[in-house]
Interface confidence: low
């Protein structure tokens, strides 16, 4: 567990000609915000494949409005870092993708309108605990300077984040053998000393000196695996009616969630549902208050009614679970229609979706034939969303406005000579051919192997295409 | 039975080098904080240094950190201390210690080993 | 770094004495702290981990307790093997650090 950090030091018109004097359309007044998505590995990902590492938006920059004769500046940024936290192991290759927000406040029908204004993709390595990383990118007339870092919180041990401490605010790290803090204590937390030489993978201890093994291993110090050691002869605990070691207890057994927390079993641990007033490991954490500021990500807390329940957590849009503390991943529901863009920005999602298709979820598909018409006696074909024509014969293009030439593909086989027809073309078939591309061969005794000619038709008469 | 016992202690001059060892049985070092404290004579205790070996995790004290490397030999089941530009102040007696992963503390204690830096 | 500053810094008492020894951190340090029993030549002795529990083998008469950022040790009948030089330790944050000791000394 760790925190990704962005900081944008400057947003503004790139260097050279052409380049934008404001971020803000005609249509008056507009701020910057911007979001930062994560993307484990170095690999090209599609744009539409989710921030599997983690996402951030940030606060909305201060007002801009362009003074018409004030030289292009640097635009007015949010104050402050963007902050990804996460939850497992940092990868050391990610992409990182830094889009740029654009939040007119004109007169727009329903509140602020979003644009996005330059989007940033780079492909890094980089450790987990270094010093911060310094980038320069250009999209399209836009320029970015930004820095960033990747650090363990607490325990910033090793380049991969793998085992920490995570206050709200904390000295640089946690001190040797303590695992994470209880979610809404400001410091570390040390779990008892197991028995000498428990494994570390495979035991765990609620009391000094003891032993407990995870399911699927057994023996004194855990370190036996259940499947395989059985009847083997080897030492340790047994069952004496068939002298074979007995599996270890199971994560769950003897319940290790103090005050009513339910077990549940997860692969090779444990994790506690803890009521409500209780939190921690094993829900070994009681008498929180409000005062104590349990609900993360700006949650509101709401004293309980009753002394079973302490405090309520009502969590904001994205955020659930007893302390607000779990992310909703509101995009992975899939809720744009139509191969339509996902964008959780915080407060509210937001659809960007294909051409042809509108709407808040991109579930109205638009009718691209309405006010289009083919011309030259062309049909309109709606699909997928993208304005079709199709076109009369002897003439193409988008809106059947050219003429095309119908003997320009050389349709007629075997030689026979193409003549364009004011309803379509007419093949001229070589001696020994037949049909309306001139494709059959004709017997010798005037008899065609496949369809005869039709009626006042003779073998070797032009053909049309009807 | 726990046991750790240290070695390598002596008479070194200011700039000078030495390896300490911490030999350990009875438990596997590997699944361990191995800490290295010391007490100068008269003084309290300082904690210098330790290694969690199995992921390579170290840490130091600021008043060694450059100086000093902690190491482990989990084949060995031995923790070192390795000393360079030794200074008047780094005299003292050195102990080896053990944490577990699973607690902050330090349960097991060697019996020390005398490092005197002095011209 | 974390300070531990620990008081008083030596103390003269009778056998069947109440002692108590205390150590106050700089900063928040959880209950990440360890109480150490050290007697001339020897190596210390841990008596209490994390804050207030009592470490395998080690008395009942030590005990360990903790108020914010203020951590105390109490013996609460002296016995003759407990004069001896008591340490306190926070392992919250690296470095990690000890206090300065207090001696309990016969009076």
């Known amino acids: 567990a760790g925190v990704f950090e962005l900081q944008i030091h400057s947003f503004g018109p790139g260097p050279g000609p052409g380049a934008p004097r404001s971020p803000c359309s005609a249509r008056g007044p507009c701020r910057l915000f911007f979001r930062v998505c994560l993307k484990p590995g170095l690999s090209e990902e599609a744009a539409e494949s989710p921030c599997a590492l983690g996402a951030a938006l940030s606060a909305r920059g201060p007002v801009y409005t362009e003074q018409p004769e004030a030289p292009a500046p640097d635009l007015p940024l949010p104050n402050g870092l963007l902050q990804v936290p996460f939850r497992d192991a940092w990868p050391g290759t990610f992409s990182l993708i830094i889009e740029t927000w654009r939040e007119e406040l004109g007169d727009q029908i329903g509140g602020p309108a979003w644009s996005l204004l330059a989007r940033v993709t780079r492909r890094r390595r980089l450790a987990a605990g270094g010093p911060w990383a310094r980038d320069i990118q250009r999209a399209g007339a836009w320029e970015l300077r930004f820095s960033y870092r990747a650090r363990c919180e607490l325990l910033a041990v090793g380049t991969a984040c793998t085992r920490l401490c995570r206050p709200r605010s904390a000295p640089s790290r946690c001190g040797p053998g303590l695992r994470p803090c209880a979610p809404l204590e400001d410091e570390c937390e040390a779990p008892p000393v197991c028995r000498a030489g428990c494994s570390l993978e495979h035991g765990f201890c609620e009391q000094p000196g003891e032993c407990r093994c995870l399911e699927g291993w057994t023996g004194p110090l855990c370190t036996v695996p259940a499947s395989t050691s059985s009847c083997l002869g080897l030492r340790g605990p047994s069952s004496a009616t068939t002298g074979c070691l007995v599996p270890g207890p199971g994560p769950c057994d003897g319940n290790p969630c103090a005050n009513g927390g339910s077990c549940s079993e997860t692969p090779g641990s444990f994790e506690c549902t803890c009521p409500r007033g209780f939190y921690g490991l094993r829900c070994e954490v009681s008498g929180v208050t409000c005062a104590d500021g349990p609900c993360f990500n700006g949650g509101l807390c709401v004293g309980g009614a009753d002394p079973d329940s302490a405090y309520i957590c009502h969590c904001p849009p994205g955020f659930q679970g007893s302390n607000c503390e779990k992310r909703v991943d509101r995009c992975s529901l899939q809720p744009c229609r139509n191969g339509g863009l996902c964008l959780d920005l915080g407060h509210a999602l937001r659809c960007r979706c294909r051409a042809g298709f509108a709407g808040p979820r991109c579930e109205h598909n638009l009718d691209d034939c309405a006010g289009r018409a083919c011309a030259n006696g062309g049909t309109c074909v709606e699909g997928g969303g993208a304005h079709r024509c199709s076109c009369a014969l002897g003439f193409g293009g988008r809106d059947c406005r050219e003429r095309a030439d119908p003997c320009a593909a050389r349709p007629c086989a075997h030689g026979g000579r193409c003549y364009a027809h004011f309803s379509g073309l007419v093949c001229a078939c070589a001696p020994g051919y037949m049909g309306s591309r001139c494709e059959f061969p004709v017997h010798p005794d005037g008899v065609s192997a496949l369809p005869a000619a039709p009626p006042g038709l003779r073998p070797g008469d032009p053909q049309r295409y009807l | 039975e726990v046991q750790l016992v240290e070695s390598g202690g002596g008479l070194v001059q200011p700039g000078g080098s030495l390896r300490l060892s911490c030999a350990a049985s009875?438990?596997?070092?590997?699944?361990?904080?191995m800490h290295w404290v010391r007490q100068a004579p008269g003084k309290g205790l300082e904690w210098v240094a330790y290694i969690y070996p199995s992921y390579g995790y170290t840490s130091y004290a600021d008043s060694v950190k450059g100086r000093f490397t902690i190491s482990a030999d989990t084949s060995k089941n031995t923790a070192y201390l390795q000393m360079n530009s030794l200074r008047a102040e780094d005299t003292a007696v050195y102990y080896c210690?053990?944490?577990?992963?699973?607690?902050?503390?330090?349960?097991?204690w060697g019996q020390g080993t005398l490092v005197t830096v002095s011209s | 770094d974390i300070q531990m500053t620990q008081s008083p810094s030596s103390l003269s008492a009778s056998v069947g004495d109440r002692v108590t020894i205390t150590c106050r951190a700089s900063q928040s340090v959880s209950s990440a702290v360890a109480w150490y029993q050290q007697k001339p030549g020897k190596a210390p002795k841990l008596l209490i981990y994390?804050?207030?529990s009592l470490y395998s083998g080690v008395p009942s008469r030590f005990s360990g307790s903790r108020s914010g950022t203020d951590f105390t040790l109490t013996i609460s009948s002296l016995q003759p093997e407990d004069f001896a030089t008591y340490y306190c330790q926070q392992a919250s944050w690296s470095p990690i650090t000890f206090g300065q000791g207090t001696k309990v000394e016969i009076k």
């Open positions: 009875g438990f596997n070092i590997s699944s361990s904080y």
């Open positions: 210690a053990r944490g577990g992963y699973y607690y902050h503390g330090m349960d097991y």
């Open positions: 994390s804050a207030s």
